[in-house]
């Protein structure tokens, strides 16, 4: 599978310093590759813009939680 092996890696080198409203967010994906300098979250907005954010920040964790909760009802 050479295409998969040589697939480009997306990295975040800078994080947004602005809190983004959850109403503007459509999805997220985590960046975990060892080829990247830091772990990150990439949010995709409802207008398909991608924004790098720091997963250690509470608003980022809350936003990820919100996006996940939209698709399933929690027990607690």
């Amino acid at each position: 599978q050479p295409d998969a092996i040589n697939a480009p890696v997306t990295c975040c080198y800078n994080f947004t310093n602005r809190k983004i409203s959850v109403q503007r967010l459509a999805s997220y994906r985590r960046i975990t590759s060892s080829k990247c300098p830091k772990e990150a979250v990439i949010f995709k907005t409802i207008v398909a813009k991608e924004i790098c954010a720091d997963p250690k920040q509470k608003w980022v964790q809350d936003s990820m939680d919100h996006l996940d909760k939209q698709t399933q009802t929690p027990k607690t």
Epitope: Y28, R30, T32, E39, P55, D65, D68, T71, Q72, P74
Partner: nanobody
Framework: EVQLVESGGGLVQAGGSLRLSCAAS????????MGWFRQAPGKEREFVAA????????YYADSVKGRFTISRDNAKNTVYLQMNSLKPEDTAVYSC?????????????????WGQGTQVTVSS
């Protein structure tokens, strides 16, 4: 390099209990939702339970609700699955995984970095 190592499986009689552990390394554990899945011989991988990054929200498959409890200790980089009132149909290999994509907690494609699994066998 991300690693997940499960432990705590074994052979138990129906009605018994087990506590599974999944120790994670190579990532900032406290910022990731985690899930437990299981796979019985000849069957597809099945969602069991999941927990959000802070541990405040938990999610369960209908088949284990009221019997299984998922929890996490972010200081120890470990997620747990307490399994009570075990049934023969709970027999499977249980694996933990890291959730890296938004969406349903019960969907395996949303997860990555699967552990090697731990065997749980429930005899009648």
């Amino acid at each position: 390099e991300v690693q997940l190592v499960e432990s705590g499986g074994g052979l138990v009689q129906a009605g018994g209990s087990l506590r599974l552990s999944c120790a994670a390394s190579g990532l900032t554990f406290s910022t990731y939702p985690m899930g437990w899945f299981r796979q019985a011989p000849g069957k597809e991988r099945e969602f069991v339970a999941a927990i959000n990054s802070g541990g405040s929200s938990t999610y369960y498959a209908d088949s284990v609700k009221g019997r299984f409890t998922i929890s996490r200790d972010n200081a120890k980089n470990t997620v747990y699955l307490q399994m009570n009132s075990l049934k023969p149909e709970d027999t499977a290999v249980y694996s933990c995984a890291v959730k890296i994509y938004s969406g349903s907690y019960s969907s395996p494609p949303g997860y990555n970095y699967w552990g090697q699994g731990t065997q749980v066998t429930v005899s009648s």
